[in-house]
Interface confidence: low
């Protein structure tokens, strides 16, 4: 059985006496201690089961060593059942036990929910000891109570290596509402239907559950906690928030925004962070998400020149890393860049718009008609060729680069000379004779350098030869010609 | 992109205790709304939800499986973990993960499933 | 806890058809069911949440409607691929799935 008692009831005895049909058969008041009357017969039968053998909690001692009579079974005294107060209120309950003093070494824990209760908690144990018996009164103080107090309590006895166990004290903390699920922020399509949940605990129980929103009472009726709420839409934000009632009182829960997702704002701050011939680095600030995530970016690229058509190229992109290069641009060109980024509900405008250049492109193609003679008097080869037809965007003319490779028995060396923009002729000075020399020409510019030209190849003889016909650039398609002398 | 993805032993003998874990990416159980739960189809039957946690460590448990079952996770490993106890021949299925809708907004259904552990329970 | 009833647990349609599954709830769901799809050796895939709104990606084809305890799943013009078991979820309180309906292909 258990009694119950209430804070706002009169106050209740530490020890009240016997409960109907418990087994307690002492009944002096624990408050007069020291004390104690009668002893209890050695078999107890349960209340529960009349004529079954009881052995919960209780210990049934031996004979003395006179042998002359039976101990008591040992078992706490029923106490106060359970506990009802408000949080921060201070609580103090008690155990109480009879031992008969040829027990030595008893001890008295408390332990909450099956865990026993150690360090710094308010428990103290008295022993009122008379001529045949020792009445122990443990008692526990919490001073504060909060919910996390709640719970059931018991006392434990070792004695003679048995266990000796209370029946339980249920201590339950009444307060405000605690939410356990508050409604959370949310960015919502418009006009489309989402929910919102509320939960709170007591106790005391039932909790009820009203919804606010933008300040005005949603439900006119409460809902038992928890609650969810759905919204059929909304066609601007809006903030909700939910009471929670009980009998103690009212807790109101933190105000959500609900949020409408709208398409992105523009992107801002669109920055060159470098250029070549045929590429552009940018990067952006990105614009409001519009309360959706960006989903992806494009990038849009007119030529700004009054020959081009005044097409718009496109490059999509993900919307993170907030950077782009755009690729296949013409070289020495001028280029006007806006970015627009999309959400789930569409594209943003775009950015404003910025101007960039590409750089000087090397050359895209190579020097034309190149020849080689052998000038075997003065040991050279004498280099002709004539200057390629490029492009405005490859820039200016700075020069040439000349590859010479001289092979003979499993030897191959390559040589490179520079030689200015005005310049269509050459002359290098023989490296190896009775070997053949392979002659190769770019043209440069600020941007690079182009294309080689395609080889050329002329057979250098042993000292003492004649002067023969030049070679030089073969036809497309043609085996590249070898003089032979 | 969300996956999800059971292991398991595989076989187990009757009264013995299942462990499973669920391991995920593209998401993150530390992102308030998100919840993952475990749901089972025995050989032949229906879908059976198990377990849900919660974000915050809150833990949902089917009523007539409860005192059976654990769920916990580990928030930084992407892993969410069940545990049963005393499994017999009724406990042979499919187990799934499954994560809760992405918005933080309850009630929530599953929108992404893994591919599912295969348990058989031998007596 | 809430139950759902699922019925048919199965039935046979020809292509280009249509079929209809209906779930009953034990109590009031506020609409907050949703539809999946599951293949042998894949995991359930969703189709429909909140009664009738369709996960992006599914084709129209598939389509839901219902309000209370009352709730019903159409597949309209039946292809091949739609060879597969159907389950109801409610989440109003916790999550319960219905029995399940296997579709077959004439």
């Known amino acids: 059985a258990i009694t119950e008692a209430r804070e706002e009831a009169k106050p209740y005895p530490l020890f009240p006496g016997p409960l109907p049909g418990s087994l307690q058969t002492d009944h002096t008041s624990l408050l007069s201690l020291p004390h104690t009357s009668g002893y209890q017969p050695a078999l107890m039968f349960s209340p529960t089961q009349p004529g079954r053998p009881y052995t919960g909690n209780v210990a049934i001692p031996r004979v003395t060593s006179a042998g002359s009579k039976l101990l008591p079974p040992l078992a706490f005294k029923h106490t106060v059942g359970h506990i009802i107060l408000s949080e921060h209120k201070d609580v103090k309950f008690n155990c109480s036990i009879s031992v008969p003093n040829i027990y030595q070494d008893t001890t008295i824990s408390w332990w909450k929910d099956g865990k026993e209760l150690l360090g710094a908690h308010h428990a103290i144990t008295q022993f009122y000891p008379d001529d045949e018996v020792t009445a122990i009164i443990a008692s526990f103080s919490i001073t504060s109570v909060q919910r996390s107090d709640n719970g059931s309590y018991i006392c434990k006895m070792k004695i003679n290596n048995e266990e000796i166990v209370s029946d339980p004290i249920y201590i339950e903390v009444q307060g405000l509402p605690h939410f356990t699920k508050q409604p959370e922020s949310m960015n919502v399509t418009r006009n489309t239907a989402f929910n919102l949940t509320c939960q709170a605990v007591g106790p005391p129980e039932p909790v009820n559950i009203f919804w606010v929103q933008n300040s005005s009472r949603v439900n006119e009726q409460p809902e038992k906690s928890p609650s969810v709420l759905t919204v059929p839409g909304l066609t601007e934000m809006a903030v909700f928030s939910c009471e929670a009632h009980n009998d103690k009182g009212l807790t109101v829960s933190k105000g959500v925004q609900i949020n409408i997702k709208a398409i992105p704002s523009p992107p801002t701050e669109v920055s060159i962070h470098n250029s070549t011939a045929h590429s552009i680095l940018i990067s952006w600030v990105p614009g409001f998400d519009g309360y959706s995530p960006f989903r992806n970016c494009s990038v849009q690229v007119k030529e700004v020149d009054p020959l081009s058509n005044g097409s718009v190229m496109i490059f999509n992109t993900s919307a993170s890393p907030h950077m782009y290069q755009i690729k296949q641009l013409q070289a020495l060109a001028n280029y006007s860049i806006g970015v627009s980024c999309m959400n789930e509900i569409g594209w943003s405008a775009v950015s404003p718009w910025i101007l960039a250049s590409t750089t000087e492109g090397a050359p895209s193609v190579a020097p034309l008609n190149v020849t080689v003679f052998l000038n075997e008097s003065r040991d050279n080869v004498d280099i002709r060729w004539m200057k390629p037809l490029t492009k405005r965007q490859a820039g200016e003319l700075v020069g040439y680069r000349i590859s010479h490779v001289w092979q003979s028995a499993g030897i191959s060396k390559e040589l490179l000379e520079e030689v200015g923009q005005n310049n269509s002729r050459a002359q290098i000075s023989v490296q190896v004779h009775n070997a053949t020399c392979t002659v190769r020409i770019a043209a440069v510019t600020k941007g690079g350098v182009g294309p080689f030209s395609d080889p050329v190849k002329i057979f250098i003889p042993a000292h003492g030869w004649v002067d023969h016909a030049p070679s030089s650039t073969p036809a497309p398609g043609n085996a590249d010609p070898v003089l032979i002398i | 992109q969300v996956t999800l993805k059971e292991s398991g032993p595989g076989m187990l003998q009757s009264s013995q205790t299942l462990s499973l874990t669920c391991s995920f990416s593209?998401?993150?159980?530390?992102?308030?709304?998100?919840?993952v739960s475990w749901i089972r189809q025995p050989s032949g039957k229906g879908l059976e939800w198990l377990a849900h946690?919660?974000?915050?460590?809150?833990?949902r448990y089917n009523t007539s499986l409860q005192s059976r079952l654990t769920i916990s996770k580990d928030t930084s490993r992407n892993q969410v973990f069940l545990k049963i106890t005393s499994v017999d021949t009724a406990d042979t299925a499919t187990y799934f993960c499954g994560r809760l809708g992405a918005y933080s907004a309850f009630p929530y259904y599953f929108d992404y499933w893994g591919q599912g552990t295969t348990l058989t329970v031998s007596s | 806890d809430i139950q759902m009833t699922q019925s048919p647990s199965s039935l046979s349609a020809s292509l280009g058809g249509k079929v209809t599954i209906t779930c009953k709830a034990s109590?009031?769901?506020?609409?907050?069911i949703a539809w999946y799809q599951h293949k042998p050796g894949k995991g359930p895939r969703l189709l429909i949440h909140y009664t009738s709104t369709l996960q992006p990606g599914i084709p129209s084809r598939f389509s839901g409607s219902g309000s209370g305890r009352d709730y019903s799943f159409s597949i309209s013009n039946l292809e091949p691929e739609d060879l597969a078991t159907y389950y109801c979820?409610?989440?109003?309180?916790?999550?319960?799935f219905g029995g399940g309906t296997k579709l077959e292909i004439k």
């Open positions: 109590q009031d769901i506020h609409k907050h």
């Open positions: 946690i919660y974000w915050d460590d809150d833990k």
């Open positions: 593209g998401f993150s159980l530390s992102t308030s709304g998100m919840g």
């Open positions: 979820l409610q989440y109003d309180n916790l999550w319960t």
